[in-house]
Interface confidence: medium
Amino acid sequence: ADPGQDRTDLLNVCMDAKHHKTKPGPEDKLHDQCSPWKKNACCTASTSQELHKDTSRLYNFNWDHCGKMEPACKRHFIQDTCLYECSPNLGPWIQQVNQSWRKERFLDVPLCKEDCQRWWEDCHTSHTCKSNWHRGWDWTSGVNKCPAGALCRTFESYFPTPAALCEGLWSHSYKVSNYSRGSGRCIQMWFDSAQGNPNEEVARFYAAAMHVNAGEMLHHHHHH
């Protein structure tokens, strides 16, 4: 499934999903970790506020399904959710899906390798019970719980490498890029908005590459 295959508009776009705005624009009051996107965002202030909560109403997803997730780890999941909900720069990786709760998803977003490495390092002592968080949960209580027989173990047990975490967690929403932060060739989950949003340049690069190659990806394979 080649990213971007279903869309002609690849730049400055919002995904057609559960909480996204239909059109990106300024959002002065974006909360805490989502604030880097306030100049141009696909999320509303209330979405940004809600996603910082444990078991937020957005998806009823409980990060603490195997005991308290370490704060150093949780901040990466919050940042990941901010990127997912707020970024208008992921158009080249939008793909249509047939799901009850959204019409589009991201696939193979090239995450800067340091962002993935740091996420894994900060989380490998926290606990979980699954290696793919999109499917297989027990939702009978309305909140995700570990399914029968799924044991709580350290992240490192379920995600033995940085790639296993970043690529496997959300069914290949991300792929680990060979490129580094600041290269203009990979998406940064973390950035300082004082310098602008570095992901705009990245989206432009890949959108241009896709047009030159008649919609085919330049980079090799493989999200939310």
Epitope: K113, Q117, S157, T161, A163, A164, G168, S171, H172, H222
Partner: antibody, heavy 118, light 109 residues
Framework: EVQLVQSGAEVKKPGASVKVSCKAS????????MHWVRQAPGQRLEWMGW????????KYSQKFQGRVTITRDTSASTAYMELSSLRSEDTAVYYC???????????WGQGTLVTVSS | SSELTQDPAVSVALGQTVRITCQGD??????ANWYQQKPGQAPVLVIY???NRPSGIPDRFSGSSSGNTASLTITGAQAADEADYYC???????????FGGGTKLTVLG
Amino acid sequence: EVQLVQSGAEVKKPGASVKVSCKASGYTFTIYAMHWVRQAPGQRLEWMGWINAGNGFTKYSQKFQGRVTITRDTSASTAYMELSSLRSEDTAVYYCARDISYGSFDYWGQGTLVTVSS
Amino acid sequence: SSELTQDPAVSVALGQTVRITCQGDSLRSNYANWYQQKPGQAPVLVIYGQNNRPSGIPDRFSGSSSGNTASLTITGAQAADEADYYCDSRVSTGNHVVFGGGTKLTVLG
């Protein structure tokens, strides 16, 4: 371009050991796991084990536990698989494969034929 | 059990649709991956995760799953698709991987 290049074919006597290498290029070696899979002539693929190229942690299939050792040299971006106490039924093509999440092997080496014969 | 079961052989007429299945308990909580292997060659990943195709894999290949069964569907089979197809899956307990026994696909005509 991602490439996994394996060492050449080997002929070994029963009871001996063999060490197969797999040199990776075109990506950051330490971010991925490397797995080893073998295939005896006309048989199915058989998973042997893996190594976290970043920290050296290994996990082996129960079937090969005690006979297989997987190591890596990060400075050379190379993974190794050593199999000891060889027997004739270990005659197979041995593959290294890069793991993108868990069990999704997107790149494979060309394979190394190990023949065990007296 | 950590077994994955595949039909040993399946045939399809040229241009028709064929479905290859893979069954096992591990597939209730893990996606299957699918590989194509031609004689004398290393396996090639054709479907991974939910239903993702590596670049270069034709869109006639697709994957799906339900319960403990994963399926690989080839819509409009070509002569070049004649090969062995293997599924694999992560086994959550112990971070192991298991392969299915393989399905030999013959394209007729």
